[in-house]
């Protein structure tokens, strides 16, 4: 073992650097004094730190900590910020453009519905931005609304125009019969099951990225114990004490140090690690019926489709309902709440169909991918936080909390701790309450996303292939898939020049009903390139 | 003629029960949500709860919730709402109001005409 | 949930035009959500005048009319009339979809 080198007999180096820690030389020493009332820095024999020292250093070792610890987490905080807020802009993009879509399908093929539909249009996807935004909004509810409200405006607008407008019974009547009558077939039930699936899919993946970033806040801002700031104060600034300003802590024992430090915060690597697989899980099933982008930007075909259903069968209603709501006023205005269970033919399953370029899913992988290279992030943090700090090299001439040493020995190490404090007794003492309730965070998100998760996962699946479809089940023709019999139906290629081209010039944003909705931004273009290839109902 | 009519106000004390009710004549009862809302003596409107259509969303004001419990039966066109634990500050006139909408709470077309709830020792 | 606010009292005289304001925050009236206005006389049930921020039910008269910009939203009434003279209150529901009111603004005809 080398003698120690000579102690600075002045403390002069010691006062020069703890000056710039805090202005003004009261507390240090001016030469080596016994230091008897130390209690971090514990004395092999005179010292130039004071007991006020000491606790400058360990408040200083803890501001350190803490921020070593943000700097770690700088670049994965950034990257789930980053993404949660082009996703959210992204589906409320979606969502605008369905609703121009639904609107302008109205507008070319419905005008005479226009004024009332748009409203109805409105409200339903003012309600789809809610439910992905979090609102507690039952879908079949939201669809059920539509149709409802559509039904008697396509009854006395289209198939009945000689009515009377005063007919408010009737329309009562009709919103009845809607339902009691299946006028829209199987359509409405084919909605709920398309939106329901792709809307609960894309409200869990916003849900799992801004838990996120909730996890890593809580870890960026977490007080370090007493405990710890006692290991890194004796880590970085003991070594100060005995004038020793240019050695460095030696790399195993950094690690030791961290490792104690961080045990309640490793304590989440294992759910850290299930969230990003599970989120994988997730976005490896987002295509098809599991992708609002799909589904939304499909939906104006499905209601233009239930609306010619309607109107294929009109003579027969048309008498059904004239002997239903001829006396409106006295009938008991009473319908059930029906399930529909007639068989879906796979070509009713009309989901517009992706190209996939630089869509929403390529950026959902994209995500992934970078997410996944951060999996380690949590049992790393002990490392990659001694790796950013001042270590010695090959752990040679170094400082091991006591004394400098030619090679650190982690038993030497331990059993000079002993006498100070258990490191062992600081791993055992478990997470810090935040922690916890973090981690119980994550449980709950991942067994959601593991419940999400397609295809086993998926229990609605089953249901699908019992009523005669597959999700998203096209063949190799994709016009099987897509939506767009009728007139005013044309396909736009690239979706994301899809948000220059769709039309803002088309006044539908401006109808009565839409009036909260926000207007495209500019930045909308560059949000997130090029979504792909959508069925437009753009003339 | 589109009616809703409430019942089952009274005086009650403070902690104990009722149960309002309120029968909707004249519409689909069943394809829109359905609201209660209070006017306390002299003040202004509080929304109470709200239920949609289907009966699976509830929606319930702060200070109610956990107390009061609002339910349907769309085969008897009637909406309810229990409340329990009464207070002082429950007293008030209770509305039904029926909703322009299916899915959840949004504006409130049609009211009945108010049953007063007195909450005393 | 908070109440949205509007002010106490509004008056004008017949014929006159009066504005009320409502004034909520970004998760409610500010956010996806829509804004009815109601009217209310002393010892009867409110009734509905405006909904979905601008639209009238029918037989609302037109001189009744709603906008709404960011957190505010306004209910204007052109051409006031004796029968005007009543309790207003705006509504909307935040993002939770719980509904909340405004306190109420008495109009007087003077």
């Known amino acids: 073992q080398p003698p120690p080198p000579p102690p600075d007999a002045t403390c002069h180096q010691v006062r020069s650097f703890f000056q710039r820690l805090q202005p003004g030389l009261k507390w240090v020493p001016e030469t080596p004094v016994p230091g008897s009332d130390l209690q971090v820095c514990l004395p092999k024999g005179p010292t130039c730190c004071s007991r006020k020292m000491e606790e400058k250093y360990q408040l200083t070792a803890r501001l350190n900590m803490e921020q070593l610890l943000q700097s770690a987490s700088m670049e994965l905080k950034f990257l789930i910020i980053q993404n949660a807020a082009v996703f959210q802009e992204a589906f409320e993009i979606v969502v605008r453009h369905a609703k121009n879509y639904t609107n302008a399908m109205f507008k070319n093929n419905y005008p005479s519905l226009t004024p009332q539909a748009f409203e109805f249009v409105g409200e339903f996807f003012t309600d789809v931005s809610l439910y992905i935004l979090g609102s507690d909004i039952n879908v079949d509810d939201m669809v059920n609304e539509l149709f409802d409200s559509l039904f008697p405006v396509i009854y006395t607008q289209l198939m009945n125009p000689g009515l009377p407008d005063s007919a408010l019974d009737i329309n009562e009547c009709l919103r009845g019969a809607r339902r009691d009558l299946k006028v829209f077939g199987n359509f409405p039930k084919l909605i709920m099951t398309q939106v329901s699936k792709s809307l609960q899919v894309t409200r869990i993946f916003l849900q799992a990225l801004n838990l996120g970033i909730e996890v890593i806040n809580t870890t960026d801002h977490l007080k370090f114990s007493k405990d710890c700031g006692r290991m890194l104060t004796r880590m970085w600034y003991c070594s100060y004490c005995q004038g020793l300003m240019m050695v460095k802590p030696c790399g195993g024992y950094c690690n030791v140090v961290m490792q104690g430090c961080m045990a309640g915060v490793v304590e989440i690597d294992k759910y850290w690690r299930e969230y990003i697989l599970s989120l994988e899980e997730l976005v490896n099933g987002m295509y098809r019926i599991y992708d609002m982008e799909n589904v939304l930007l499909g939906l104006f075909s499905t209601i233009h489709d239930s609306i010619q259903y309607v109107q294929k069968n009109a003579g027969k209603l048309t008498t059904t309902i004239g002997k239903l709501c001829a006396h409106s006023q006295q009938r008991q205005y009473r319908s059930a709440y029906y399930p529909e269970d007639l068989f879906i033919d796979k070509k009713v399953l009309k989901v517009a169909h992706v190209e996939h370029e630089e869509t929403l899913s390529s950026r959902r992988r994209e995500l992934i991918q970078k997410l996944k290279s951060f999996i380690s992030f949590y049992s790393a943090l002990p490392g990659y936080i001694c790796s950013h700090s001042p270590v010695a090299e090959n752990d040679t001439l170094c400082w091991n909390g006591q004394e400098l040493v030619e090679r650190y020995s982690q038993k030497a190490a331990r059993n000079g701790m002993k006498n100070q404090f258990n490191l062992h007794e600081l791993k055992m003492k478990g997470p810090e309450p935040v922690v916890s309730q973090i981690i119980d965070k994550l449980k709950h998100i991942n067994q959601l996303l593991r419940t999400m998760s397609m295809p086993k996962g998926r229990v609605l699946d089953k249901n699908l292939d019992e009523e005669g479809f597959e999700s998203g089940d096209c063949g190799d023709d994709e016009d099987e898939c897509i939506g767009g019999s009728g007139d005013g139906m044309i396909k736009v290629k690239n979706q994301l020049r899809f948000l220059a081209e769709l039309a803002y010039d088309l006044d539908v944003d401006d109808a009565p009903g839409n009036s909260q909705q926000a207007t495209p931004k500019d930045n909308e273009i560059s949000t997130f390139h090029n979504l792909g290839n959508v069925h437009s109902p753009l003339k | 003629q589109v009616q809703l009519q409430e019942s089952g106000g009274g005086l009650v004390q403070p902690g104990r029960s009722l149960r309002l009710s309120c029968a909707a004549s004249g519409f689909t009862f069943s394809t829109y949500a359905m609201n209660w809302v209070r006017q306390a003596p002299g003040k202004g409107l509080e929304w109470v709860s709200a239920?949609?259509?289907?009966?699976?969303?509830?929606y319930y004001a702060d200070s109610v919730k956990g107390r009061f419990t609002i339910s349907r039966d769309n085969s008897k066109n009637t909406l309810y709402l229990q409340m329990n634990s009464l207070r002082a500050e429950d007293t008030a006139v209770y509305y039904c109001?029926?909703?322009?909408?299916?899915?959840?709470?949004?504006?409130?077309?049609?009211w009945g005409q108010g049953t007063l709830v007195t909450v005393s020792s | 949930q908070s109440a949205l606010t509007q002010p106490p009292s509004a008056s004008g005289s017949p014929g006159q035009s009066v504005t009320i304001s409502c004034t909520g925050t970004s998760s409610d009236v500010g956010g996806y959500n829509y804004v009815s206005w109601y009217q209310q006389y002393p010892g009867k049930a409110p009734k509905l005048l405006i909904y979905g921020n601008s639209n009238r039910p029918s037989g609302v008269p037109d001189r009744f009319s709603g906008s709404k910009s960011g957190t505010s939203a306004s209910l204007a009434i052109t051409g006031l009339q004796a029968e005007d003279g009543a309790d207003y209150y705006c509504?909307?529901?935040?993002?939770?979809?719980?509904?909340?009111f405004g306190g109420g603004t008495k109009v007087t005809v003077l």
């Open positions: 109001a029926k909703d322009r909408r299916g899915s959840h709470a949004d504006a409130f077309d049609v």
């Open positions: 239920i949609s259509m289907s009966g699976e969303s509830t």
């Open positions: 509504q909307s529901y935040d993002s939770s979809l719980r509904v909340v």
